[in-house]
Amino acid sequence: QPCPYPMAPPNGHVSPVQAKYILKDSFSIFCETGYELLQGHLPLKSFTAVCQKDGSWDRPMPACSIVDCGPPDDLPSGRVEYITGPGVTTYKAVIQYSCEETFYTMKVNDGKYVCEADGFWTSSKGEKSLPVCEPVCGLSARTTGGRIYGGQKAKPGDFPWQVLILGGTTAAGALLYDNWVLTAAHAVYEQKHDASALDIRMGTLKRLSPHYTQAWSEAVFIHEGYTHDAGFDNDIALIKLNNKVVINSNITPICLPRKEAESFMRTDDIGTASGWGLTQRGFLARNLMYVDIPIVDHQKCTAAYEKPPYPRGSVTANMLCAGLESGGKDSCRGDAGGALVFLDSETERWFVGGIVSWGSMNCGEAGQYGVYTKVINYIPWIENIISDF
């Protein structure tokens, strides 16, 4: 005997359509785009019913239910807004992701996503992954460098990329993105196999203050060309933090130099070094200090360090020098690993041009200069480490 004629559920259709369905005949249900098969409350990948010899179908008719993409994922350092209606997550619903203003900017796409028939939130470019809120780099309360003056106390927000590194000795670093610290290889060399021993602090001006943002190291990457106790060539390292830090006016990453950065780092251009290193009084500074110093001609610097006690070739092409011929303005022990920063007048953002590396035994000595790792030479190395890890 024939089976009852199958009536398609709303938003679905029967295939094949026959005048009658007898023993072993079958039909399938296909839902319209944006609808999915449900048996009871359970989703089905496909549905086919077969006519049995007693004249009944072997399975009950399913329903075609509108696709629901479900609540969208939270966007780190951002938020999501329901455009179609509050909490509407069904087929063709629209949501808009945005990043926290001022300190984050959206990468990948415009943040607009639509609930598509496959049940995925999908961007206008067809991406199913979330957009990315990337920290804005190089923001500072300081508007310009320009004048040379030394031993100045930093104010809140002046050097929000400044990182204090404790672990054996006092050193410094600069925040990159929201989970990396750029520093000098010699400053963290002893901890390269014990990254967790590094006590990393940021968001504070006072070295001894109990009020700071704590970060811990997951891994230390020392440049493979650096040889400890054999000069300071390739004196650069990256610390990967085990968690992303929250960006705000007191904690902001420094920018890496663009290709055009060298035009802001010519001889006599002013850079700014900051740190808690030794001051003229011979003690570590309690408050974060900074000094604006000019870049020194490379040949002049090389010559200054060619006489004893310095070995020939101390100053390499991977270094840049800064300071005053008359002395008095310099970085010193305890500042190592900190950033020598420059203002990019086109983007109005600060970028790291140098890393505090080495200098004369007596800081601020006349005719001697502070020597800094030339960061622009290491952009491929930095980018490779960060993308691989």
């Epitope: 009871g40 359970l42 629901d68």
Partner: antibody, heavy 118, light 107 residues
Framework: QVTLKESGPVLVKPTETLTLTCTVS??????????VSWIRQPPGKALEWLAH???????SYRTSLKSRLTISKDTSKNQVVLTMTNMDPVDTATYYC??????????WGQGTLVTVSS | QPVLTQPPSVSVSPGQTASITCSGD??????AYWYQQKPGHSPVLVIY???KRPSGIPGRFSGSNSGNTATLTISGTQAMDEADYYC?????????FGTGTKVTVLA
């Protein structure tokens, strides 16, 4: 925030009946396409589905245990109750209640260890 | 009740890709679901309806399902991914779980 919490005896004697209660919050037992499942896991073994109930009161049971299981819900108390008769030491397991959404068991309770021993 | 068979164990080095299979008769005609369970914890849904990730599950988890085999893939495996993994499917209106796979991330 969706939460499910199992409660019931930690020790039952062989042949006794086990009654487990699942108290839910953060979603409704009476609306939508949501359901609640009971799943168990004997120590060191795999997960074993037992039964489920949906908002429409549609129920389903593990074939091999169907005669021993009963699932019900009390919407006013936000509770789902599972009873299992004629308990045996082999029924010793951690019993979980969990929410079903879009066919996936997306929120689980912390589980309750039930030991069957005389 | 139908059987879903998984390999008992899978070992993977950090950063490498781990693939866990789940085999069952015409499994590709049904939706597959995957759960992660760490010792002493309740299971966590990591993939639903073959290839969809619930909110909060990292992008390194992905799924596929065709023929008689569903596969869970963990790309760039991390130490925290070490756990037991179970597949699950619905047969009519009853749920069936796989035998489980222990994923070990080599030190």
């Amino acid at each position: 925030q969706v939460t499910l919490k199992e409660s019931g005896p930690v020790l039952v004697k062989p042949t006794e009946t086990l009654t487990l209660t699942c108290t839910v919050s953060g979603f409704s037992l009476s609306r939508g396409k949501m359901g609640v499942s009971w799943i168990r896991q004997p120590p060191g073994k795999a997960l074993e589905w037992l039964a489920h109930i949906f908002s429409s009161d549609e129920k389903s049971y593990r074939t091999s245990l169907k005669s021993r299981l009963t699932i019900s819900k009390d919407t006013s108390k936000n509770q789902v109750v599972l009873t299992m008769t004629n308990m045996d030491p082999v029924d010793t397991a951690t019993y979980y209640c969990a929410r079903i959404r879009a066919g996936g068991i997306d929120y689980w309770g912390q589980g309750t260890l039930v030991t069957v021993s005389s | 009740q139908p059987v879903l068979t998984q390999p008992p164990s899978v070992s993977v080095s950090p950063g490498q890709t781990a693939s866990i299979t789940c085999s069952g008769d015409k499994l590709g005609d049904k939706f597959a679901y995957w759960y992660q369970q760490k010792p002493g914890h309740s299971p966590v849904l990591v993939i639903y309806q073959d290839n969809k990730r619930p909110s909060g599950i990292p992008g390194r988890f992905s799924g596929s399902n065709s023929g008689n085999t569903a596969t869970l893939t963990i790309s760039g495996t991390q130490a925290m991914d070490e756990a037991d993994y179970y597949c699950q499917a619905w047969d009519s209106s009853t749920a069936v779980f796989g035998t489980g796979t222990k994923v070990t991330v080599l030190a």
